[in-house]
Amino acid sequence: MAVTACQGLGFVVSLIGIAGIIAATCMDQWSTQDLYNNPVTAVFNYQGLWRSCVRESSGFTECRGYFTLLGLPAMLQAVRALMIVGIVLGAIGLLVSIFALKCIRIGSMEDSAKANMTLTSGIMFIVSGLCAIAGVSVFANMLVTNFWMSTANMYTGMGGMVQTVQTRYTFGAALFVGWVAGGLTLIGGVMMCIACRGLAPEETNYKAVSYHASGHSVAYKPGGFKASTGFGSNTKNKKIYDGGARTEDEVQSYPSKHDYV
């Protein structure tokens, strides 16, 4: 019963985690404009892995995709790759774990096969969670580096009096979603691995020997516990705008009070 609960909980936690990783990957708020010096701004910038957005005080939001692949920073590409790998592994892990669930009966699948699949999905969830945490952490590190670099050059004098303010970016909501989601996926994976141990049938290749000593009855089993991981020969393996003068009709921006484009 405890094994089923652990496995089921691990599955649910991992499912929530992977949904969070997908959400974080799709979110536009990976980095948001730092508002420390100006809490109320007329133009607010935020960026995601796939596009950057500008929300005006008027309520209009305009988002632009990164249509270049080669022109993007290597770090951003690496973060994208880590998140996608995390999602793919997580999705496969979910698929495997569905069949591994003790509460689901599929033909005459043995417990050893279910244990094997539970462990496989658990490892996949762990790697998926680590990929997400790594991706988010790499991006966060990139932000911190850029933040202090832009703080050093915050105001660049142009002809004495004129000042150009460099936009600084800080952690966006997606980073926190990613960290939490990665952590949940990781925890779910660990729970699946724990559940795998309970699912695995105990093998006893010996006879129990009883020793009787002065009034006490003690049973002694030599050899200790042997858990079948299912990777032996006895297992049955079962096999996601430009410049220039323009009229307003040429401008594509959308009002966004309720949702962000």
Epitope: A42, V43, N45, S57, S58, G59, Y241, H258
Partner: antibody, heavy 118, light 113 residues
Framework: QVQLVQSGAEVKKPGASVKVSCKAS????????MNWVKQAPGQGLEWIGN????????SYNQKFKGRVTLTIDKSTSTVYMELSSLRSEDTAVYYC???????????WGQGTTVTVSS | DIVMTQSPDSLAVSLGERATMNCKSS????????????LTWYQQKPGQPPKLLIY???TRKSGVPDRFTGSGSGTDFTLTISSLQAEDVAVYYC?????????FGGGTKVEIK
């Protein structure tokens, strides 16, 4: 069509308060921020502040903060600007204006003249 | 606060001639997020509220004649009336829409020579 209709001219004594209204029609009232602009006689334009009719959030020019209050009545699609502790330099035409792309003001009310005189 | 400085204060141009006025901001109005300049131009005729001509420094509002052209980037901006008409006699204001408080220039008065 979009229309912003403001209340009539007001004459007030120094130290008093004035509440100017701006009724919007012809568009989704909660979809656009409303701004207030002051124009003293023979002078230029001065931004007072704005209000988001959807959330009710406000932004004020520090120069007017503490003396000006912007409020809304969604049921009548009306925005109000209340200016307290009036002084002679508050004598001006006050405009309400709808905020558009680029934070520009695309539609303006006809203006309300407020005269502060003892 | 961003200070907007307009020049000249007044401008007398013959009908059909080109009228050019400038606007300088104390800080860049170019937003790095979308590479747009948050500068707006308005026209105000006596006894009337201002009328929006150009936003994002160069985008004409629909219904505005194409003789009105906005240009510039960063801190220096220009409004050009390619062929002045009698109805263009007015005061023209530029506005910072990038940073609060939103600020206006002192205005340029355009008259017929």
């Amino acid at each position: 069509q979009v229309q912003l209709v403001q209340s009539g001219a007001e004459v007030k004594k120094p130290g008093a308060s004035v509440k100017v209204s701006c009724k919007a029609s012809g568009y989704s009232f909660t979809g656009y921020n409303m701004n207030w602009v002051k124009q003293a006689p023979g002078q230029g334009l001065e931004w007072i502040g704005n209000i988001d009719p959807y959330y009710g959030g406000t932004s004020y020019n520090q120069k007017f903060k503490g003396r000006v209050t912007l409020t809304i009545d969604k049921s009548t699609s009306t925005v109000y600007m209340e200016l307290s502790s009036l002084r002679s330099e508050d004598t001006a035409v006050y405009y309400c204006a709808r905020m558009y792309h680029g934070n520009a003001f695309d539609y303006w009310g006809q203006g309300t003249t407020v005269t502060v005189s003892s | 606060d961003i200070v907007m400085t307009q020049s000249p204060d007044s401008l007398a141009v013959s009908l059909g001639e080109r009228a050019t006025m400038n606007c300088k901001s104390s800080q860049s109005l170019l937003n790095s997020g979308n590479l747009k300049n948050y500068l707006t131009w308005y026209q105000q005729k006596p006894g009337q509220p201002p009328k929006l001509l150009i936003y994002w420094a160069s985008t004409r509002k629909s219904g505005v004649p194409d003789r009105f052209t906005g240009s510039g980037s960063g801190t220096d901006f220009t409004l050009t009336i390619s062929s002045l008409q009698a109805e263009d006699v007015a005061v023209y204001y530029c506005q910072n829409d990038y940073s609060y408080p939103l600020t206006f220039g002192g205005g340029t008065k355009v008259e017929i020579k």
